[in-house]
Structures are given as structure tokens and as C-alpha cells.
């Protein structure tokens, strides 16, 4: 008499998360009698998945009609598969007894679950950096399977090369996560730039997922300061202009000081944007020269985005010949400068 065989025809089955998995198992004989049980894993720690004799297994249904009297098909269907269901499933025949005795196991069917990666989330640096500095962006995606995955970084459409990527865990797992860091050197023109993290996986059918970050969140473009004096007016008033140009972000406070005393403070708001995303701002100060007997030291002080203040200073000299005036005289553009205005 031929020995009973437990046949699991498929060595492996791959299923997309959310779908149903069919695990096939047939026996070559109804004798000896005894239950068929399905387990995930082998050995003492194996997990009972389905007992065709008794029990409540809401996600598992027999493929064959269990009311067939000569049934030798013990295949099961597991619904709503998740990555946690991955593993090797064994169809095991027991011989009836008290308790039932394991008689023979099938060779096992490895169930792998194809799970889509989550939408990539890109995060940038916690603090802004200025041009020529390098900042790091991180991209994370989770919950995918199988482990093979491709991640690319782009800045304004150009692929970045200074990238470090890790897929965890290194060993076998029901699902995986990817974390990648890209280092980007900032330029003053990067206010409108964008970095893209692109993830390609077998479950995405060639349509990669993308996460983006705007460099505007990471960059600070410090302003240029230029102080100029317009022509002396007939009423002995000098119009001094402080031009603050090419800065980003808009958060900026300008303070005028006369001889070290605050004359006026202004906050930038609702400024028009330059083509490159930066902003310009001009502030005027009228100085009544005749009201001063001594020279007047004017300072344009700019605090940008919480950074230390940048000053431009110059002196207006009270002259015996006030009508002899300079025209469009500019203070220098670096450091703290003083300029004598006649």
C-alpha cells in the first residue's frame, strides 16, 4: 500500500498586500484519517494558521468544498494579506489519536508579500544655511517588500551624487524601510530650487513615488547693504537711502540710528519678489543738517532672519557752506563703514 503523501505544489507564492493568497495542498489518500492543519513556520514555535477540523479563523477559508465526502484538497485562501503574513506555510497531516499525532508535512510554500513603499517624506535641515554651505536632506519610506528598492535624488532635475542610503533591516523581514541622506551645496540662486527624492519599487509598476523639499526652507541669502545720499535740499535736509538687496527670507528689520540713538525701526512686509526669489527693500531717512551743530553719524542697521545685525554707518558733516553738497554718495558695502558727507 502506497504511503500517504502531502503535496504542496508551489515552492513559493508572491502576493500584493491587500490581495488574497491561495496556498495549495492535496493528500494522496484519505487513509489514515486525521485532521489537516496549516502552520506558518516549522518547529516548536510554529504558528497555527488553520485547522480544518475545528476553530475560528476569520481570514482563512478552504478552497475546496469542505462538504465533499471524498475531499483530498486541503488548499486554503488567506484574505487581505499584509506584510506580517509573509513566511513559509506548511500543510500538515495528522493521524487521529488522543492527541492527534503528526504524520506528514508538505514541503512548505513560502509566501512573500509585495507591499508598496509609503510616500517618501523629505526633511531638510533644522536651521537655514547660507550660500556655499552644505546642507543635508533626508528621505524616508517605509513598509515595502521585497527588499530591493531604488532611491535617487535630484536637484532641479539633475541627479545628485553625494548621497548615502540605507535599507533596514539588513536581514530577512516582513517589510523594510529606506533612509537616504543627500548633501547639497547651496548657491545664492537656490531660493527657487527643489530637491526630489524618487523611489522605485517592483510594486509601483514603473511609476516611482516622489517626495520633495524646497530649498527655500533651507537657505538664507544675506542682504547687500548700500547707503547713498541724495542731493542736499534747499531746506538743508539731506535724504539718505539704505538699499537692502538680494535677501531671503523676507524676515528683516531695519533700524536707523542718529549718533547711536534709534531714530526709526521698520519691518519688511509684503515685498515684491525678485525673479530669483530674493527680495529688495529701500528705506529713506531725512536728516535736517541745520538742526545739528556737530557732525551726524548715521547708521543703517539690518537684522535679517534672526542673524546678528549688519551695519552701514557714515557721517554727515555740518558745513559752513551747506550749499556745497555731494551727490549720490554711497557708503561702502562691507563691514561697518563711515562716510563723511559735505
Amino acid at each position: 500500500e502506497e504511503e500517504l503523501q502531502v503535496i504542496q505544489p508551489e515552492k513559493s507564492v508572491s502576493v500584493a498586500a491587500g490581495d488574497s493568497a491561495t496556498l495549495n495542498c492535496t493528500v494522496s489518500s484519505l487513509i489514515p484519517v486525521g485532521p489537516i492543519q496549516w502552520f506558518r513556520g516549522a518547529g516548536p514555535g510554529r504558528e497555527l494558521i488553520y485547522n480544518l477540523k475545528e476553530g475560528h479563523f476569520p481570514r482563512v477559508t478552504p478552497v475546496s468544498d469542505p462538504t465533499k465526502r471524498n475531499n483530498m484538497d486541503f488548499s486554503i485562501r488567506i484574505s487581505n494579506i499584509t506584510p506580517a503574513d509573509a513566511g513559509t506555510y506548511y500543510c500538515v497531516k495528522f493521524r487521529k489519536g488522543s492527541p492527534d499525532v503528526e504524520l506528514k508535512s508538505g514541503a512548505g510554500t513560502e509566501l512573500s508579500v509585495r507591499a508598496k513603499p509609503s510616500a517618501p517624506v523629505v526633511s531638510g535641515p533644522a536651521v537655514r544655511a547660507t550660500a556655499e554651505h552644505t546642507v543635508s536632506f533626508t528621505c524616508e519610506s517605509h513598509g515595502f517588500s521585497p527588499r530591493d528598492i531604488t532611491l535617487k535624488w535630484f536637484k532641479n532635475g539633475n541627479e545628485l551624487s553625494d548621497v548615502q542610503t540605507n535599507v533596514d533591516p539588513a536581514g530577512k523581514s516582513v517589510s523594510y524601510s529606506i533612509r537616504s541622506t543627500a548633501r547639497v551645496v547651496l548657491t545664492r540662486r537656490d531660493v527657487h530650487s527643489q530637491v526630489i527624492c524618487e523611489v522605485a519599487h517592483v510594486t509601483l509598476q514603473g511609476d516611482p513615488l516622489r517626495g520633495t523639499a524646497n530649498l527655500s526652507e533651507a537657505i538664507r541669502v544675506p542682504p547687500f547693504l548700500e547707503v547713498t545720499q541724495q542731493s542736499m535740499r534747499a531746506d538743508n535736509q539731506v535724504n539718505v537711502t539704505c538699499q537692502v538687496t538680494k535677501f531671503y527670507p523676507q524676515r528683516l528689520q531695519l533700524t536707523w540710528l542718529e549718533n547711536g540713538n534709534v531714530s526709526r525701526t521698520e519691518m519688511a512686509s509684503a515685498l515684491p519678489e525678485n525673479k530669483d526669489g530674493t527680495y529688495n527693500w529701500t528705506s529713506w531717512l531725512l536728516v535736517n543738517v541745520s538742526a545739528h551743530r556737530d557732525d551726524v553719524k548715521l547708521t543703517c542697521q539690518v537684522e535679517h532672519d534672526g542673524q546678528p545685525a549688519v551695519n552701514k554707518s557714515f557721517s554727515v558733516k555740518v558745513s559752513a557752506h551747506p550749499k556745497e553738497q555731494g551727490s549720490n554718495t554711497a557708503a561702502e558695502n562691507t563691514g561697518t563703514n563711515e562716510r563723511n558727507i559735505y
Epitope: I31, P32, K53, D65, P66, T67, K68, R69
Partner: antibody, heavy 120, light 106 residues
Framework: EVQLLESGGGLVQPGGSLRLSCAAS????????MSWVRQAPGKGLEWVSA????????YYADSVKGRFTISRDNSKSTLYLQMNSLRAEDTAVYYC?????????????WGQGTLVTVSS | SYELTQPPSVSVSPGQTASITCSGD??????ACWYQQKPGQSPVLVIY???KRPSGIPERFSGSNSGNTATLTISGTQAMDEADYYC?????????FGGGTKLTVL
Amino acid sequence: EVQLLESGGGLVQPGGSLRLSCAASGFTFSSYAMSWVRQAPGKGLEWVSAISGSGGDTYYADSVKGRFTISRDNSKSTLYLQMNSLRAEDTAVYYCAKDGGSYYPPFDYWGQGTLVTVSS
Amino acid sequence: SYELTQPPSVSVSPGQTASITCSGDKLGDRYACWYQQKPGQSPVLVIYQDTKRPSGIPERFSGSNSGNTATLTISGTQAMDEADYYCQACDSSTAVFGGGTKLTVL
């Protein structure tokens, strides 16, 4: 409470036909296989035929194969046995029996039986 | 085809233990069921899967099955247990019954 009620028995001449019915109640009819078992006067039980819950699989004893047809109407919770080319040896009380529902099912409920007499 | 053999009759005194046997080739590898049939009544399942008792069946009914023989045991037999008893191999597409055993309670 599970109930099985057979009907359709009677006297029929050899070579004639008869259709037995079994009306079921008290359980989900489509979830269980059903069988016909007969008992000739003063004799033992003889299994005749079985049908799976969906009706897709049918089984017959060699003694009735080709002459009897088992069927079911799950919408009416009714089991049938169409008996053709009847012979004297088919004379018996015919019981309809419900399978227990496991993979090795006993007959856990039986009807009261209907007598079929084949005689000229 | 598979055959099951039962003794045609068994006698027992009230209160004693009655044993009814059912023999078949490697019957112990199969599940045995037992039915009780009283005169003029339909059969009633008393034992299934060798040893299990359906609800409503008294504890005095028990079963065993190994080798080539299944046994129905009625301990403390009562007069009401007098009936025909049929064994069945409950595992194949064609349900096989034994010839039946008439239990007489003396």
C-alpha cells in the same frame, strides 16, 4: 431544531420511476452535504447516494449508479432523489440524512423515512 | 469495496457492560461512527470520530478504535438501550455500514 421530512414514497411497478423529496429546516442547508440511506424490510442500513453542499459533487452506491440521481435546491432547502428503472430489491424505507459537517462526517440527523415499494 | 463486520447479536444483563465490535481492514486508520436504531424509528448517532458523543447521548455510551476493530461500549446497560446498533466508516465518499448488531437486554 434540525428537522428532515421525507416524502414521495409509495408503490411503484418494476421499471417505474419515483421522486423522493426531503424538506430540511433548522440549519443552513447549503453548508452541509446530504445523503440518502435506505433500509430494506428487516435488513441493515445501506448508503445510497450523497451530494455536497453546493450540489457540485455527487456520489452513488454501485447498486444504484446510472439509475438514481441525487440533487438539491438550496433556495428551497430541499433534497431530491430521482429513482428510475426501479427493481424489487430497491424496496426499502428511504431516509434522508444530514452530514455532520466535518471532513469525516457522520450522519448526525436523520428523517423519519419514506417507504418505497417496488412490486408488480 | 470496504467491508465492516459486526456480530449479529449481543446479549447483556441490565446494569452490566455491553461491548459491540466492528471489524474492518485497518479500521483503526479510519474514523468509526455508531448509530442506534430502535424498532420503527430512525437511526440516531451515538458515537462519532471513534470516541466522541453528540450532545444528548448519555455518558454510558463510549467508543474506541484501533488496529482492525472499533468497539461500542455501553456501561450500566439499561432496558431502553435495547436496539440495533450499526457501525460506519465515516471517511470515504461512499459511506460503508456494518451489518448491524441486535443488542438484547435480558
